[in-house]
């Protein structure tokens, strides 16, 4: 079960970073309804995070890398949470 | 322009929430980061929010401090204050903190 | 976390002249070039300059230039002004950000 949450978050992740490089940023994600905010980041009042845009004007590696990884860690809370939720739903039944 | 507010005379062991605005650019479309100077001293980078929601923070800060977003603000809190926390805060924008607001001071002291 | 380990202060300079600001940190910054230089006058708050090494930053004069590679870095203030007197400080980003670490400063003085 892990190899494959593992597989999911590493071609959600791949997807993510084809679509960062087109300019596209979440929007697809959030249609497939992988949005939501993380817990522990922003409030209840925070806007959806996929309503949110890029990080400014820099283009250079290090932007681009930390922009990558913040990617990847949404993506990976997003999911565990997902899986999370599932084994609890699992476990009521 | 970006603005912080919050920072006040606190004693030892208080927590604290800075906060964070901005005006003339969407706060939610930036990445954000907060350093802190204490008086007389160099920069001291604390950590930063992705647009994602995300957190990275300097290995010194040991959980003590936390940041999070919401659309129109970011927000540092702080706990486990000792007088060693006592300096001016910064927020600023982006990655390579390209803008900066005018700090707001936190004085720990019994 | 990473150390930044700047030129000693004060660096002296006369108006015309020419000033060097050295930055050695104690690992690779990311992709060799993860260094900004910010300056800051008292009371104020810092100002970038130059990022990924050696890009000027948005509205920031041509006299500054920046240089290096991997651990050393370089600022270089070319026909230094009576306005440049000010602390500099560089900033390294790393593959771990918790290591990210501003180095100690260096003030000029413009005689």
């Known amino acids: 079960r892990r190899d494959v949450a593992h597989g999911i978050l590493n071609e959600a992740y791949r997807k993510v970073l084809d679509q960062l490089s087109a300019g596209k940023h979440l929007q697809s994600l959030v249609a497939r309804g992988v949005g939501g905010s993380l817990g522990g980041g922003a409030g209840d009042d925070a806007e959806p995070l996929s309503k949110r845009h890029s990080d400014g004007i820099f283009t250079d590696s290090y932007s681009r890398y930390r922009k990558q990884m913040a990617v990847k860690k949404y993506l990976a809370a997003v999911l565990g949470k997902r899986y999370k939720q599932r084994v609890k739903n699992k476990g009521r039944r | 322009s970006v603005e912080e507010s919050g920072g006040r005379l606190v004693t030892p062991g208080t927590p604290l929430t800075l906060t964070c605005t901005a005006s003339?650019?969407?706060?939610?479309?930036?990445?954000m980061g907060w350093v802190r100077q204490a008086p007389g001293k160099g920069l001291e980078w604390i950590g930063d929010i992705s647009t994602y929601g995300t957190t990275d923070y300097a290995s010194w800060v040991y959980g003590r401090f936390t940041i999070s977003r919401t659309s129109t603000t970011v927000t540092l809190k702080m706990t486990s204050l000792t007088t060693e926390d006592t300096a001016t805060y910064f927020c600023?924008?982006?990655?390579?903190?390209?803008?900066w607001g005018q700090g707001t001071l936190v004085t720990v002291s019994s | 976390a990473a150390v930044l380990t700047q030129t000693p202060s004060p660096v002296s300079a006369a108006v015309g002249g020419t000033v060097t600001i050295k930055c050695q940190s104690s690992?690779?910054?990311?992709?060799?070039?993860?260094l900004a230089w910010y300056q800051q006058k008292p009371g104020q708050p810092p100002k970038l300059l130059i990022y990924?090494?050696?890009t000027l930053a948005s509205g920031v004069p041509s006299r500054f230039s920046g240089s290096g590679s991997g651990t050393e870095f370089t600022l270089t203030i070319s026909g230094v002004q009576c306005d440049d007197a000010a602390t500099y400080y560089c900033?390294?980003?790393?593959?771990?950000?918790?290591?990210?670490?501003f180095g100690g400063g260096t003030e000029v003085v413009v005689k």
């Open positions: 990924a090494a050696s």
């Open positions: 600023a924008r982006d990655y390579w903190l390209s803008l």
């Open positions: 690992q690779s910054v990311y992709d060799n070039n993860a």
């Open positions: 900033l390294g980003g790393y593959y771990d950000p918790a290591d990210n670490a």
């Open positions: 003339g650019f969407s706060l939610s479309s930036y990445a």
